[in-house]
């Protein structure tokens, strides 16, 4: 005996013209009726409506409306989904990949989420991670290979090497931009003491007892002294690079000008300072005439020495 099909109770959907059609049930095998699926649900063929068929075994499909999950519901930071489809049906698994430098919670470069009855099984997670760095003159105190954000990796220097000022152990932290710093251990013999003092000048920073290799220290000269050379020195192989010199200024005094019956051209200073290489213009005092060449009245300051012209 052919079993009729009772009125179909379609979860998350229904028959079109349901109230009119109720009269036709139970229905005989072979009968088909159009039906629709609610929002976020689709028919097994992937559309929003289809036909439900009465068969000898009952209604087909047995689950007329399948849950769908939308790609737009996925919030993925620091990763991407390469599949082109925008709608995924129940139990469909979707793959996602993490950007370089990021990994899933279990440390893989890719992961998957599944469309379940209540939506996606989870949101994709791509956590910042740091790979084991390359160590120079040192070794890691951990045998892990991948480290999560905020993880700390301790390391120690080989014998004869240190991190800073006698410390031989250190740690680096995995941050958003990678490791907090590069684990560097330098040869203890390459440290420098305080940089050399210079005459008529000084360092711009307070002095340490020990400087690590590649440290830079800046010098400055006293007022009116001119810095010659680089104003920085660098610690390399236990030695500082050549410090600068502070070149004496030329001090033009009223006494020296009176001796030579001259005065500064266009200036009334009693004392005037000029740097090396500066040109100082003189002229004869009223009632005096030049006793030296015209060129000598444009004197050039050379490391504190200036040759004064003379007027008689």
């Amino acid at each position: 005996e052919v079993k009729p099909c009772d009125f179909p109770e379609i979860q998350h959907g229904g028959l079109y013209y349901k109230s009119l059609r109720r009269l036709y049930f139970p229905a005989a095998a072979g009968q088909s009726y159009s039906y629709y699926c609610d929002q976020n649900f689709v028919t097994p063929s992937g559309s929003y409506w289809d036909y439900i068929h009465c068969t000898q075994d009952g209604w087909s499909p047995t689950v007329p409306c399948l849950r769908t999950c939308s790609k737009s519901d996925i919030e993925i930071e620091n990763g991407f989904i390469s599949e082109s489809s925008s709608i995924y049906i129940l139990n469909k698994e979707i793959q996602y990949k993490c950007k370089p430098g990021y990994a899933t919670a279990d440390g893989n470069s890719s992961g998957s989420i599944t469309c379940l009855q209540n939506g996606w099984s989870a949101q994709p997670i791509c956590i910042k991670f740091c790979d084991m760095p390359v160590f120079e003159n040192s070794r890691a105190k951990s045998n892990g290979m991948r480290f999560k954000l905020h993880d700390t990796l301790d390391y120690e220097c080989y014998d004869g090497y240190e991190i800073s000022y006698g410390n031989t152990t250190g740690s680096i932290v995995c941050g958003e931009d990678g490791w907090s710093h590069f684990p560097t251990c330098y040869n203890s013999s390459e440290k420098c003491g305080p940089p050399p003092p210079i005459s008529n000048g000084d360092t711009t920073s307070f002095l340490l007892k020990v400087y690590v290799p590649q440290s830079r220290v800046e010098y400055q000269c006293q007022s009116y002294y001119e810095l010659q050379g680089s104003n920085y020195v660098t610690c390399s192989n236990g030695e500082w690079s050549e410090p600068p010199r502070c070149i004496h200024p030329c001090i033009i005094t009223e006494e020296n000008m009176n001796k030579n019956n001259i005065q500064l051209k266009g200036k009334s200073d009693i004392k005037y300072y000029a740097k090396t290489g500066d040109t100082i213009e003189f002229m004869c005092k009223l009632g005096y005439n030049a006793n030296t060449s015209v060129l000598s009245f444009q004197a050039v300051c050379r490391e504190g020495i200036v040759e004064y012209p003379r007027c008689e």
Epitope: G166, S188, K191, G193, F206, L207, L208, K209, V210
Partner: antibody, heavy 124, light 107 residues
Framework: QVQLQQSGPGLVKPSQTLSLTCAIS??????????WNWIRQSPSRGLEWLGT?????????VYAVSVKSRITINPDTSKNQFSLHLNSVTPEDTAIYFC??????????????WGRGTLVTVSS | EIVLTQSPGTLSLSPGERATLSCRAS???????LAWYQQKPGQSPRLLIY???SRATGIPDRFSGSGSGTDFTLTISRLEPEDFAVYYC????????FGGGTKLEIK
């Protein structure tokens, strides 16, 4: 109790080398947390720091500009002492010479322990 | 180099009084880099204060240091007979230099 014991001649002739030694007891010249200094005191120049030696995985010597070309400070680990050599002395170098310890850290230079001082006269 | 000028040259006070000694630097010295010493006749100097305000081991709390930049002060709150001596300031920011000293004498 840490002590510094100074020794050396009290009279040096001009142009010769002034040499003083400072023996350390209760601490080590190669300590990683101390530096060993020479300071002198005269009526004309007051207290004047001359230089230091210290060990931080390797030996460092730092000298004052005023004596840089004439001074050497040597540590002697076998005897746990350090010495001062100041050459080409003149009567201007007549002073009381103190050896001192500095226990300041990387940045600090201050002297928490002093020897008794040696009066050195430069005279022919 | 940094020149330290101490004032007054001589300070005459009585036991029980408060002493204020000044040390002025020719250029700015971080407060971390100033120390004070006491020297009695025929003796070596003794460290009192380092880092401008930290008392050295065994120094009584009547000694205190303060100041920053170019002006520093050593204060002895209540003078004891053994406090009459010469006091020196010292900077150690760039090389090491000492002040000329202040003689604290009994009035």
């Amino acid at each position: 109790q840490v002590q510094l014991q100074q020794s050396g001649p009290g009279l040096v002739k001009p142009s010769q080398t002034l040499s003083l030694t400072c023996a350390i007891s209760g601490d080590s010249v190669s300590s990683n947390s101390a530096s060993w200094n020479w300071i002198r005191q005269s009526p004309s120049r007051g207290l004047e720091w001359l230089g230091t030696t210290y060990y931080r995985s390797k030996w460092f010597n730092v000298y004052a500009v005023s004596v840089k070309s004439r001074i050497t400070i040597n540590p002697d680990t076998s005897k746990n002492q350090f010495s001062l050599h100041l050459n080409s002395v003149t009567p201007e170098d007549t002073a009381i010479y103190f050896c001192t310890r500095d226990r300041g850290d990387l940045l600090h230079w201050y002297f928490d322990l002093w020897g008794r001082g040696t009066l050195v006269t430069v005279s022919s | 180099e940094i020149v330290l000028t101490q004032s007054p040259g001589t300070l005459s006070l009585s036991p029980g009084e408060r002493a204020t000694l000044s040390c002025r630097a020719s250029q700015s010295v971080s407060s971390s880099y100033l120390a004070w010493y006491q020297q009695k006749p025929g003796q070596s100097p003794r460290l009192l204060i380092y880092g401008a305000s930290s008392r050295a081991t065994g120094i009584p709390d009547r000694f205190s240091g303060s100041g920053s930049g170019t002006d520093f002060t050593l204060t002895i709150s209540r003078l004891e007979p053994e406090d009459f001596a010469v006091y020196y300031c010292q900077q150690y920011g760039r090389s090491v230099t000492f002040g000329g000293g202040t003689k604290l004498e009994i009035k």
